[in-house]
Amino acid sequence: VPDKTVRWCAVSEHEATKCQSFRDHMKSVIPSDGPSVACVKKASYLDCIRAIAANEADAVTLDAGLVYDAYLAPNNLKPVVAEFYGSKEDPQTFYYAVAVVKKDSGFQMNQLRGKKSCHTGLGRSAGWNIPIGLLYCDLPEPRKPLEKAVANFFSGSCAPCADGTDFPQLCQLCPGCGCSTLNQYFGYSGAFKCLKDGAGDVAFVKHSTIFENLANKADRDQYELLCLDNTRKPVDEYKDCHLAQVPSHTVVARSMGGKEDLIWELLNQAQEHFGKDKSKEFQLFSSPHGKDLLFKDSAHGFLKVPPRMDAKMYLGYEYVTAIRNLREGTCPEAPTDECKPVKWCALSHHERLKCDEWSVNSVGKIECVSAETTEDCIAKIMNGEADAMSLDGGFVYIAGKCGLVPVLAENYNKSDNCEDTPEAGYFAIAVVKKSASDLTWDNLKGKKSCHTAVGRTAGWNIPMGLLYNKINHCRFDEFFSEGCAPGSKKDSSLCKLCMGSGLNLCEPNNKEGYYGYTGAFRCLVEKGDVAFVKHQTVPQNTGGKNPDPWAKNLNEKDYELLCLDGTRKPVEEYANCHLARAPNHAVVTRKDKEACVHKILRQQQHLFGSNVTDCSGNFCLFRSETKDLLFRDDTVCLAKLHDRNTYEKYLGEEYVKAVGNLRKCSTSSLLEACTFRRP
């Protein structure tokens, strides 16, 4: 019988008392085969973290700083359940740390040196740890003691709770630096008042502070937020302009064997019976013998943290960077304006080999990081382990939802001004064998399908989006008799046709022979009835252009396109017979790396781009014999995006809407995780 007990860790007598009450009340409402609570008492949160790691306890609720500690080796804990605040309809699990300034003050984030600063309090998250952590490497050396470095960075500050004797500059704007509401500039509202009164130039607070202190929009319009990319935005655009997004209060558990489903089952049932306004006898979010015992008193309920989300992703790149800077205190030798090497994310070993050759030829401007799937690569770019990669539009959508930005677009047509003219896109098509003459768009049910990969534009999002509109359900594996759609569940009929061996079967990378455009076309040639690819795929793999044994004798005339009106046309008539226009593949990165990725890639394509004529004796960035490694092989150049520099603008309203409609069919664990952080 599986043990269905969750051992909750308590850090005080009062918490232990509430835990026992929680245990007893849960027993009275949950059947005997349901989850139960046991209480473990420890002296501190750090002791609780160690106890959970050692399997002496299972769960504890922590604020963000401790979630970071819990994640560090050897603890390796992960977030499993988040408290939410506000309403069930609009649950808030995060707050945003922001830098507020007056509208007419005219400086940016990188010009804070010598300004006057207002902080909520020394050592507090939004008011100190996050801004000072992010500014850490700009502080004058020596950076220890930290208070002295901060005092020398700003021309004057109010940092309540600082030592006014040792660091008088930190108390210059609020004499005495009082550590309570007796100091008018203490806390969130106090720090904002410090800015409002004109004492300081910038206030480090949370996003709701300005709304709580200024009910009138006209008054709020006198203020702006400083963004990390050295721009400013209105105060209501905090989701796109903040220092960090911080989880409020989170239940953590072991990463392996951590009982996360059981913990959720327990807490979900607990909130049903003892949540806000549910019971008089016992209230989960109330602490008669103290404050915030086990859970925050202000919490309204719990939300399950998506399983794909580790602590790094949950806390976010900015928060992790800030806390790591403060804890480890390490900075690059000398902060220069020169770009660091770009860490390119390569999928599986074929891409890694090409990336390594690029790295050698770039003389260290490019470094390589490997991952097994595109989503793993996107996650690595999010958390800073990698910097950039080129993605199909479907993954540009996921990357965008995860906070990444497009920086350059692949262009596939030769033109005089290639780098300055991003193209409108390519065509997503459905290809069939000419010999299967009765096959049309309207009778695909029960046929064998070949897809580039789940989540990709031409191979999945466009055809399956159109199909969804017709069949109104997501059971595509029942619609087709079998197929190969790399990235599907291994037991799905949409992995049945795939050719990868062992664990590589149906993997969304080049280890699966039917992956990508060329792979999907090969699947059609060898096993399938229809392949969903791009309009260039057939000509690129016929007429001897692909020397591989399966392709070398193929003839373009033996294939036709399915048109949406139920007719068929020759392959060259794609402009009048396609499923939709697809946005070109694009390079994505984090916002903070955008300028450097742009600069280095433009240098690299001038050295190794399509101007290189002999690829047998030279490195060619856009060549890999139809394998589309790192970039599509038909890329002519990487083009500037001009103003299409967000995923929505780049992909276009129509495509974003189409993918949004398919979201209900999405199996993307990463998309689920990212929409948890930003619904």
Partner: nanobody, 117 residues
């Protein structure tokens, strides 16, 4: 198609040196990029050092300042001079020229380097 054969490995004490050679069965003058990789037990194969036809070199951070890659096109040989060896340099070392099969996995036998006291 050029075949590559690695040699020069062996057992060496920490702090010691070794010089690995990679002999090609044909001309390497037209081959753009050549490189040394290594694979420790249970680890992924990783790039150690690479060199282009023009003589530009690149090294993994872990070996910078200790290892030197070079090529002799006249002798059709790639070299890796390894100084100040550490126990963590223990691995099988392979050379490659990237030119075969467009990034398919074609590896020779490699040569074992063991750094131990």
């Amino acid at each position: 198609e050029v075949q590559l054969v690695e040699c020069g490995g062996g057992l060496v004490q920490p702090g010691g040196s070794l010089r690995l050679s990679c002999a090609a069965s044909g001309s390497i003058a037209s081959i753009n990029t050549m490189a040394w990789y290594r694979q420790a037990p249970g680890q992924q194969r990783e790039l150690v050092a690479g060199i282009t036809r023009g003589g530009s070199t690149n090294y993994a951070d872990s070996v910078k300042g200790r290892f030197t890659i070079s090529r002799d096109n006249a002798k059709n040989t790639l070299y890796l001079q390894m100084n100040s060896l550490k126990p963590e340099d223990t691995a099988v070392y392979y050379c490659t020229d990237y030119s075969r099969g467009y990034y398919q996995d074609y590896w020779g036998q490699g040569t074992q380097v063991t750094v131990s006291s």
